[in-house]
Interface confidence: medium
């Protein structure tokens, strides 16, 4: 029988009455327009909702917005528009919520054309009160908080000025003109690019990269001939124009731009791009676009210095600069990433890696599924996941894949089972082991969310018709109960739950439509009475992550260590609770050659784990530029994979080669950099 229909599934007793007592409706006294929702702080229960409505008049558009606040996870809302003087808020800037639990909020107002500057409303008490501040400039971007100090804000103006505030937007100072892009780094450092001649667009490839570590008192030029820059983990990347032609190369710094090394990545031409797919303090995934309008490129993974790169995946789907890629970090299990490749026949296939890009493989076919029409062999096929690209192509896919760090092993995604992604209506699949095995969870497209660290999964069918039913599961998607949350169906627009998946509240957003009006409405359902008791020790079971062969004592070893987790038993209906902390037990593994990548000048022949010297580099000076200085590179041919914790076992020490090299690119070398003070 289908999941949810057998006898096993009658576990949650009297749930209708329990949920009915915990379902809270709020009708917003609003014409429909658009709505945006932001959570303020963590575990505070504070939600801000901004509704906006545009009335097109003959010569202009008249806008009206309303601001609502909840402090009980969305059960009740209060209209607080008067706190912002009934001002129209610009939705393209959204609500700028401060980092961590700072309680800070910045709203950017719409101002009339002739005004000297913009206007913001600031709150530092979780939106209980707001202060109106007139700006000495018109903002081009949303206010950006320093990750280290929420009183420090930066913004770009419509005239390309870089403005900084040190007192949470009360007073602003323009610290530099002609700025294209600005980003906060660590320790309240600001990195930004500037143009000298006409504009950001005209000077692309001739920009300068600057740094200030004291909020604009002094500056240092840390790069020239810059096309763009990015920050990822502890790495600072710059895409730099080559001296001789129109190609560009990536340079990397791990000391905030004081010294640079050329990344051992292919150079790209005018129509190509680089993209940092993911980065942490250990390593980076970098996409390098193929020449021509192919829609694909190559993923490379870095060493711990961000300099030496190993080819990870060919024909990686990534449409155009700023376009669509399906690259997804599965946050519920270490080392797991999912993405799509474009096959020779132009079909799209899903690939998964369990070891941080070391090896990629197809997703295993779900046990309870048949291969679809895309499969040549009806008995052999794979699961293919719909992500950003499918959504951009307007396929019937309402949501991207979902995983949460505290819902260990759980991944939920739309997919199809065959030789490639299908354009047919997808179903929803779940993995409870981080992507190793999959099960069909729900028929047809759904919205879904995870509550109580995986203790509850909630889903709503994706339909063009009004809906009034929500589905929920307390056993990781095996069995489903349905609950009618309102007599009058609503046009559904979205599910909202507090980020972090610790909450037991879910808000269903939509609108009602009658002959005369349409209004926003939300239903917030609290599942606390479904999970009546707190989980105890007996409710958890030991689970070894990445286990594929329980026989092997190295079973579960990924990046040099294995982890045993305490996981909630599927049969246990209880609350993990808001304070739930994932319990894991790591064990170090013995090293094998798989724990090492090949250093610069070395490669792995196919089906061999040993690193051998690249024949074309034997006896040659290597085109390798370390910190922009002439120096010898010594290597033993192997380098531990970033983040790998293995000990003992294989220790691939070999004779240390003295690899001479010439610096072909020295425009980021220290002697070319300069400093100045304001």
């Amino acid at each position: 029988s289908a999941p949810g229909e057998d006898e096993e599934c009658g576990r949650v007793r009297d749930f209708v009455a329990k949920l009915a007592n915990n379902t809270h409706q709020h009708v917003f006294d609003d014409l429909r327009g658009s709505v945006s929702l932001s959570w303020v702080g963590d575990s505070t229960g504070v939600i801000l909702v901004l509704t906006t409505f545009h009335v097109p008049l003959v010569i202009m558009t008249f806008g009206q917005s309303k601001l609502y606040r909840s402090e009980d996870y969305g059960k009740n809302f209060k209209d607080i528009t008067d706190l912002i003087n009934n001002t129209f808020i610009r939705t393209e800037f959204g609500m700028a919520i401060g980092p961590e639990n700072s309680g800070k909020v910045v709203l950017t107002a719409e101002v009339s054309g002739g005004s000297r500057g913009g206007r913001i409303f600031r709150s530092s008490d979780f939106a209980k009160n707001f202060v109106q501040t007139d700006l000495p400039f018109h903002p081009l971007t949303q206010m950006m908080y320093s990750p280290q100090n929420s009183d420090y804000l930066l913004a770009l103006s419509t005239e390309n000025g870089l403005w900084v505030s040190k007192n949470f937007g009360g007073k602003w100072e323009e610290i530099h003109k002609a700025v294209c892009l600005a980003k906060w780094g660590s320790d309240n450092t600001i990195f930004f690019t500037t143009y000298a001649n006409g504009s950001c667009k005209a000077d692309l490839g001739a920009l300068e990269l600057w740094r200030t570590s004291d909020l604009g008192k002094s500056f240092k030029t840390i790069g020239v001939k810059i096309y763009s820059f990015g920050l990822g983990g502890r790495f600072l990347f710059a895409s730099v124009m080559a001296d001789k032609d129109t190609t560009r190369r990536i340079h990397v710094s791990t000391d905030q731009g004081d010294t640079w090394s050329m990344a051992q990545l292919p150079s790209v031409g005018q129509e190509q791009f680089y993209s940092i797919l993911a980065a942490n303090d250990d390593m980076v995934f970098m996409h390098v676009d193929e020449p021509g309008d192919t829609g694909f490129g190559t993923i490379f993974t870095s060493d711990d210095r961000g300099i030496v790169y190993s080819k990870s995946l060919d024909r990686h789907l990534y449409t155009t600069t700023g376009g669509e890629t399906d690259f997804t970090n599965v946050t519920s299990l270490r080392g797991v990433y999912i993405t799509s490749v474009l096959s020779e026949d132009n079909s799209i296939q899903t690939m998964i890696t369990f070891d941080q890009g070391g090896r990629w493989t197809h997703l295993r076919k779900p046990e309870n599924s048949e291969c679809d029409a895309t499969a040549k062999n009806k008995n052999e096929c794979s699961l293919h996941i719909h992500a950003s690209y499918s959504i951009s192509q307007k396929l019937n896919v309402p949501m991207a894949p979902l995983s949460e760090p505290n819902a260990v092993g759980i991944v939920i995604a739309h997919g199809s089972v065959g030789d490639a992604i299908s354009v047919m209506v997808p179903d929803v699949y779940i993995s409870d082991d981080g992507g190793y095995s999959w099960t069909k969870m729900l028929e047809g497209p759904h919205y879904y969310t995870i509550l109580d660290s995986g203790g509850i999964i909630v889903a709503i069918e994706h339909s063009s018709r009004p809906i009034n039913v929500i589905k929920f599961s307390t056993d990781e998607g095996q069995c489903w109960q349905t609950y009618t949350f309102t007599r009058d169906p609503i046009y559904f627009t979205g599910l909202a739950s507090e980020p972090g998946a610790r909450s037991m509240n879910i808000s269903i957003w939509g609108f009602t439509e009658s002959f005369l009006t349409s209004q926003w409405v939300s239903y917030t359902i609290d599942f606390k009475d479904i999970l009546e008791r707190n989980c105890e020790e007996k409710d958890y079971t030991i689970w070894l992550a990445h286990s594929t062969d329980p026989e092997d004592y190295e079973d579960g070893c990924i990046l040099g260590y294995k982890e045993q987790f305490l996981r909630l038993r599927k049969s246990s209906v209880c609350q993990n609770g808001r304070d739930y902390v994932v319990t894991k037990q790591p064990s170090i593994c013995l090293c094998s050659l798989e724990d090492f990548l090949c250093d610069f000048g070395y490669y792995r022949p196919e089906n061999d784990s040993k690193c051998v010297e690249q024949p074309e580099l034997k006896g040659h000076d290597l085109e390798f530029c370390l910190y922009g200085r002439e120096e010898h590179l010594t290597t033993n041919g192997y380098r531990k994979i970033p983040g790998d914790k293995c000990q003992g076992g294989v220790n691939p020490v070999r004779e240390v080669k003295d690899l001479k090299k010439k610096c072909t690119s020295n425009f980021l070398s220290p002697e070319k950099q300069n400093s100045k003070s304001n």
Epitope: E551, Y553, P586, S587, Q647
Partner: antibody
């Protein structure tokens, strides 16, 4: 009740061989990894070898590698340790121990004595 | 190999005392440590695994703490059947290694 009973300990000359066995009634033997651990006369403990539940994987301490072989017969619920090229420093009480899913020294046998002396 | 250094090698204690035995690992082992008890002339009994987890059937007066390199076993309100030898063992990596043992003797 889970119990492990070792046998086969004896007095043997240096360079000689000996086979120890461990009978494991009272639990599903084939689902557990098993270890041999020895206790020297001065009461120091030394891990000797481990074998996975199905017998596919074995690991040894460097001091016995190449001389000792751990094996199991899941049909008979028996763990074995074949010892050859014995040295005087192999003199010890030998214990078999069960590996549970959490850790490697869950249940212990009563031990059997091996003496290597000329 | 990871060296497990156990202190003290022996101690004289009285009934009702609270006793702490420590083990230092020569390198980080997370909490991959167990504690064993051996009574005179007898075999071994597992007391604690993963540093802090009490094995089923072991009295709650036994507790373990620590992670990384420094660990301890504490017995609160010592009872007569607790006079025995105690060993720590690391199972973070092969070869598994044991501490030198601590003998609890009657004062």
């Amino acid at each position: 009740e889970v119990q492990l009973v070792e046998s086969g300990g004896d007095l043997v000359k240096p360079g000689g061989s000996l086979k120890l066995s461990c009978a494991a009634p009272g639990f599903t033997f084939s689902t557990y990894g098993m270890s041999w651990v020895r206790q020297t006369p001065d009461k120091r403990l030394e891990w000797v070898a481990i074998i996975s539940s199905g017998g596919s994987y074995t690991y040894y301490s460097d001091t016995v590698k190449g001389r000792f072989t751990i094996s199991r017969d899941n049909a008979k619920n028996t763990l074995n340790l074949q010892m050859s090229s014995l040295k005087s420093e192999d003199t010890a009480m030998y214990f078999c121990s069960r590996s549970s899913s959490h850790w490697y020294f869950d249940v212990w046998g009563t031990g059997t004595t091996v003496t290597v002396s000329s | 190999d990871i060296l497990m250094t156990q202190f003290p090698s022996s101690m004289s204690v009285s009934l009702g005392d609270t006793v702490s035995i420590t083990c230092h690992a020569s390198q980080g082992i997370s909490s991959n440590i167990g504690w064993l008890q051996q009574k005179p002339g007898k075999s071994f009994k597992g007391l604690i695994y993963h540093g802090t987890n009490l094995k089923d059937g072991v009295p709650s007066r036994f507790s373990g703490s620590g992670s990384g390199t420094d660990f301890s076993l504490t017995i609160s309100s010592l009872e007569s059947e607790d006079f025995a030898d105690y060993y720590c063992v690391q199972y973070a990596q092969f070869p598994y290694t044991f501490g030198g043992g601590t003998k609890l003797e009657k004062r």
